[in-house]
Amino acid sequence: AGVFELQIHSFGPGPGPGAPRSPCSARLPCRLFFRVCLKPGLSEEAAESPCALGAALSARGPVYTEQPGAPAPDLPLPDGLLQVPFRDAWPGTFSFIIETWREELGDQIGGPAWSLLARVAGRRRLAAGGPWARDIQRAGAWELRFSYRARCEPPAVGTACTRLCRPRSAPSRCGPGLRPCAPLEDECEAPLVCRAGCSPEHGFCEQPGECRCLEGWTGPLCTVPVSTSSCLSPRGPSSATTGCLVPGPGPCDGNPCANGGSCSETPRSFECTCPRGFYGLRCEVSGVTCADGPCFNGGLCVGGADPDSAYICHCPPGFQGSNCEKRVDRCSLQPCRNGGLCLDLGHALRCRCRAGFAGPRCEHDLDDCAGRACANGGTCVEGGGAHRCSCALGFGGRDCRERADPCAARPCAHGGRCYAHFSGLVCACAPGYMGARCEFPVHPDGASALPAAPPGLRPGDPQRYL
């Protein structure tokens, strides 16, 4: 057993051009906190896979407000270490994910809002009990500097925290065959309690008579390396010569225990011994409680009053994931108009508009008529990012500078003759028709169908169209 410790030294803009904007502002003050997730081995695992070695959340850092005009400095950090306790042997090789979270303290409805600023990941070899290891990781334009170490909790010692130490029974020296416990020279190695023959390098025990293997080793005494090559022999016992493990059928086949739990066979089935922080038949339930604040983005934590009862995060609309840490892709509904680019900022959707458009959803055409005149009394009409002129009667062209022939479109109906006039056009109607465009037939009794002729005008008189 032991503790992995992480010390964050700084989080701020990395070197080089393109310094990030400060995540906080006078309008939206914020503070940072960190989350670390540890997994055994060097395998590339998805960020969502379980933190089998454990996880920890830091305290919140001091509130920070950006100084107007100043570049983003190194941001104020939470006090103290992030500590991830591990119950079993330290694996020696591990993968880590360190996330930097921002807590916005503006006037959000329903309390503060959280958003992920940066996530770094890596794979490292580390012996327990060694000195602090320093590291620098970059995520986009941000840079995270940190140190880490693994230390054993007494009575465990050694690079994997698998050797046990006990206080000396005699002040001068350790008992026969027992060495002093470095670096605790005043303590001695405990008598060997593992199964006889259990490999001192690749095996360990926590109970008398057992022999549990470190990653990469197998066999009853942990002397057989697990082969990565395919096994050609039929199903049966493992071969110590080839190092090829061919498991026999059994309830612990494939290790049904999740999250780093160890499986042991029982007369009827199997039993999982779970690492700290997990429980359940297969160690599938996390022992984090609601008091640890596991639900992000305003998620409501239910249950989990103590480590022996599960918690569930009820996520607010727009968030998902077991800890409400993932945002639903609201931009997939394509709310931005006119080809605008959608950005989900968390607290709001933003649209980056194409040239010629503006507004929260790019719904407004910019006034392309600004500074553009339409001649001869024409009116400018905006649309589609370009302007056009609606010209007064008798004029045409892009800017209404061309004199138009009002008769070109043959506006007079029923064979009426068109005459251009300084203020428009005049139709001389054929017999039997009347109206500005000769559109109305005249009935035989002299009454017009629609409408009545204006006073002073007889059917057949030219009428000016205004």
Epitope: P317, G318, R330, L333, Q334, P335, C336, R337, N338, G340, L349, P360, R361, C362, E363
Partner: nanobody, 120 residues
Framework: EVQLVESGGGEVQPGGSLRLSCAAS????????MGWYRQPPGKQRELVAG???????IYAESVKGRFTISRDNAKNTVYLQMSSLRAEDTAVYYC??????????????WGQGTLVTVKP
């Protein structure tokens, strides 16, 4: 405040049909975009179908030809007609709307969800 109220969910056999409705009410000046998302058990929420800000109709690849989205502007309501339903369509279906409020601000709203179960 704006409310989105979904209805029409339920249990249906494979190959069957259902029609979901979502009515928006409250201080709505206009609805900019509106549609349906779904979240199958243990998976991410994904867009199923919607009317975009440009009033185009969009569909997830997996539902094209089987689902049809329609709307009644006068009632601020969208519908999702689901036919030839499959087991993998089982999910909670959420209505979503990008709304312009009387204040002229835009806000994105979610309904509470309606469960659709497809099983023999």
């Amino acid at each position: 405040e704006v409310q989105l109220v979904e209805s029409g969910g339920g249990e249906v056999q494979p190959g069957g049909s259902l029609r979901l409705s979502c009515a928006a009410s409250g201080s709505i000046l206009s609805i900019n975009a509106m549609g349906w998302y779904r979240q199958p058990p243990g998976k991410q929420r994904e867009l199923v179908a919607g009317f975009t800000g440009d009033t185009n109709t969009i569909y997830a690849e997996s539902v094209k030809g089987r689902f049809t989205i329609s709307r009644d502007n006068a009632k601020n309501t969208v519908y999702l007609q689901m036919s030839s339903l499959r087991a993998e369509d089982t999910a909670v279906y959420y209505c979503a709307a990008d709304v312009q409020l009387f204040s002229r601000d835009y806000e994105f709203y979610w309904g509470q969800g309606t469960l659709v179960t497809v099983k023999p």
